[in-house]
């Protein structure tokens, strides 16, 4: 169909903020559960600890986590799981000070990736019981379909 | 031509990951050589330590480098060279801990810039023999034509 | 109207760099005054310490500040003020080393948000007399209309 000026710019977008973060007893990771704060389009679906891709294509993904932890290095890994395999897309790593009063760092990263229909995107902190700040302006996750 | 729904969203994109990193003997810099991990469109061409702009326009550029170095500050400079001059577009700077076990930081930055046909974009670390982690999900470079 | 290939890609963009940074005597904040370095479209207007949204919609916002300060944590808050209320959109936080020679960090963050006509966007450093580096490639602010 011919595009109007208004239709032209409608990139699907999804900006998510945390509901909570949990660690499984048997694994050295902390996962974040997400809820939409801004959504445009139907190609992305938050579900529990992941985001399901319903509309394949090239996306700008971004992730920030706000850490309050004296563990010497902290960070997050953004991965996609689909077609029977898991792939790390990008990660963010931050050295943390050893003093609790100073141990406060946000870690932001982003990139452009091809995502497939049915992929599940997740943000993993490879630390059990990681001390995160779940403020919606400190920890968030986002997608823009390009 | 009238745009179809499919044509509408085809931003040219290029996401690059490292092949290697080298230092010249006579200069206090480390340069990264790049290879495409994701490409859409023909307006950008990886060539050695740079990316050649074949299609002028406004681009979102992003850069991340993962440092494993105890030098007190590390970071990267994203520059364009063209029309006989070099221009720094943006830079990322990260203070590093002095203990090798803690000296692990990614540095991400990005911005929107007008790039000219023939420009060569490069990522320079202003340190000879900088200790980088060249994992493709830790160190990368990207472009989105807007 | 039918879009030509050229019209298709014209996202409004604005990339701003600092003019100066000041602290009000009676408040524990430092504000940055901005000037455009790159502008495409008319939907955004730099005015003093803020950016006025003239064209409502969904925007990718990004902010980087380069800190040269030994205060234990530094960072910036990106907020919008409009319709009689203020809302924090996102923030960046960086722990700083206590030694002045090492106290050098850029802090970058970004996200996608719906901005309303008349909103004023600002970058606040919640520290009086924060020591910032106002280099245009170290401290900047940007918008892309999606």
């Amino acid at each position: 169909a011919v595009l109007t000026q208004k239709q032209k710019k409608q990139h699907s977008v999804l900006h998510l903020v945390p509901i909570n973060a949990t660690s499984k007893d048997d694994s050295d990771v902390t996962e974040v559960m997400w809820q939409p704060a801004l959504r445009r389009g139907r190609g992305l679906q938050a579900q529990g600890y992941g985001v399901r891709i319903q509309d394949a294509g090239v996306y700008l993904l971004y992730s920030q986590v706000l850490f309050q932890d004296v563990t010497f290095t902290m960070g997050q890994v953004v991965s996609r799981e689909g077609q029977g395999r898991q792939e790390t897309l990008f990660r963010c790593i931050r050295s943390m000070p050893s003093h609790p009063d100073r141990a406060y760092n946000s870690c932001y990263s982003a990139g452009v990736f091809h995502l497939h229909q049915g992929d599940i995107l997740s943000v993993i902190i490879p630390r059990a019981r990681a001390k995160l700040n779940l403020s919606p302006h400190g920890t968030f996750l986002g997608f823009v379909k390009l | 031509a009238v745009l179809t729904q499919k044509q509408k969203k085809q931003h040219s994109v290029l996401h690059l990951v490292p092949i290697n990193a080298t230092s010249k003997d006579d200069s206090d810099v480390t340069e990264v050589m790049w290879q495409p991990a994701l490409r859409r469109g023909r307006g950008l061409q990886a060539q050695g330590y740079g990316v050649r702009i074949q299609d002028a326009g406004v681009y979102l550029l992003y850069s991340q480098v993962l440092f494993q170095d105890v030098t007190f500050t590390m970071g990267q400079v994203v520059s364009r060279e063209g029309q006989g001059r070099q221009e720094t577009l943006f830079r990322c700077i990260r203070s590093m801990p002095s203990h090798p076990d803690r000296a692990y930081n990614s540095c991400y930055s990005a911005g929107v810039f007008h790039l000219h046909q023939g420009d060569i974009l490069s990522v320079i670390i202003p340190r000879a023999r900088a200790k980088l982690n060249l994992s493709p999900h830790g160190t990368f470079l990207g472009f989105v034509k807007l | 109207a039918v879009l030509t290939q050229k019209q298709k890609k014209q996202h409004s963009v604005l990339h701003l760099v600092p003019i100066n940074a000041t602290s009000k005597d009676d408040s524990d904040v430092t504000e940055v005054m901005w000037q455009p370095a790159l502008r495409r479209g008319r939907g955004l207007q730099a005015q003093g310490y803020g950016v006025r949204i003239q064209d409502a919609g969904v925007y990718l916002l990004y902010s980087q500040v380069l800190f040269q300060d030994v205060t234990f944590t530094m960072g910036q808050v990106v907020s919008r003020e409009g319709q009689g209320r203020q809302e924090t959109l996102f923030r960046c936080i960086r722990s700083m080393p206590s030694h002045p020679d090492r106290a050098y960090n850029s802090c970058y963050s970004a996200g996608v948000f719906h901005l309303h006509q008349g909103d004023i966007l600002s970058v606040i450093i919640p520290r009086a007399r924060a020591k910032l580096n106002l280099s245009p490639h170290g401290t900047f602010l940007g918008f892309v209309k999606l």
Epitope: - | S27, T88, A128, R129 | D101, N133, G138
Partner: antibody, heavy 121, light 107 residues
Framework: EVQLVQSGAEVKKPGASVKVSCKAS????????MHWVRQAPGQGLEWMGY????????KYNEKFKGRVTMTSDTSASTAYMELSSLRSDDTAVYYC??????????????WGQGTTVTVSS | DIVMTQSPSTLSASVGDRVTITCKAS??????VAWYQQKPGKAPKLLIS???NRDSGVPSRFSGSGSGTEFTLTISSLQPDDFATYFC?????????FGQGTKLEIK
């Protein structure tokens, strides 16, 4: 106390080379770069480049590339600047000056006393 | 290269005067500007870095301001020891460049 002590005055013939030394004390030598700046008689200051003792890597002003060599000896906490193919307009006072290790975004906070180099036939 | 243009090149003033020296950069250098004082036969001495930060031990009568392309060094009340040549320098972009200097002399 930070101190930078430079070698003595030199008189050289055109085409020759000169090597100036700068011995640092009072700080960790490898944590700072050493800039070299020159000043022709009655003229302003001109940045020539720096040596980073941490990795013994230089950064040169393009104007001097091919003629200047900057090195360091960490065991002696000493930086060196050698200028070759000397011309009469290289007659100047040559200063070493300390800058922080990231080089950019830091001023030169301590300076040596200067070394006068005279190029004359 | 970035050109740093200082004015005036010579300034005559008296003890107790307030004097201002300006420096204009040919392109935006943020606040990455330093001011140095040099006396005859001596090395330059750092007064101000980051456009406005006084170096340790520098008297409070010296102040710097500006960002972007326009910078000023102000001496609020001239003392006999202040008669010297002053240089601005940008350290935002390689090669680092200096102004041509302002000679402050006794009126």
């Amino acid at each position: 106390e930070v101190q930078l002590v430079q070698s003595g005055a030199e008189v050289k013939k055109p085409g020759a080379s000169v090597k100036v030394s700068c011995k640092a004390s009072g700080y960790t030598f490898t944590s700072y770069v050493m800039h070299w700046v020159r000043q022709a008689p009655g003229q302003g200051l001109e940045w020539m480049g720096y040596i980073n003792p941490y990795n013994d890597a230089p950064k040169y002003n393009e104007k001097f590339k091919g003629r200047v060599t900057m090195t360091s000896d960490t065991s002696a906490s000493t930086a060196y600047m050698e200028l070759s193919s000397l011309r009469s307009d290289d007659t100047a006072v040559y200063y070493c000056a300390r800058g922080l290790g990231y080089a950019l975004y830091y001023a030169m906070d301590y300076w040596g006393q200067g070394t006068t180099v005279t190029v004359s036939s | 290269d970035i050109v740093m243009t200082q004015s005036p090149s010579t300034l005559s003033a008296s003890v107790g005067d307030r004097v201002t020296i300006t420096c204009k950069a040919s392109q935006n250098v943020g606040n990455n500007v330093a001011w140095y004082q040099q006396k005859p036969g001596k090395a330059p001495k750092l007064l101000i870095s980051s456009a406005s930060n006084r170096d340790s031990g520098v008297p409070s009568r010296f102040s710097g301001s500006g960002s972007g392309t326009e910078f000023t060094l102000t001496i609020s009340s001239l003392q006999p020891d202040d008669f010297a040549t002053y240089f601005c320098q940008q350290y935002n972009i390689y090669p680092f460049t200096f102004g041509q200097g302002t000679k402050l002399e006794i009126k």
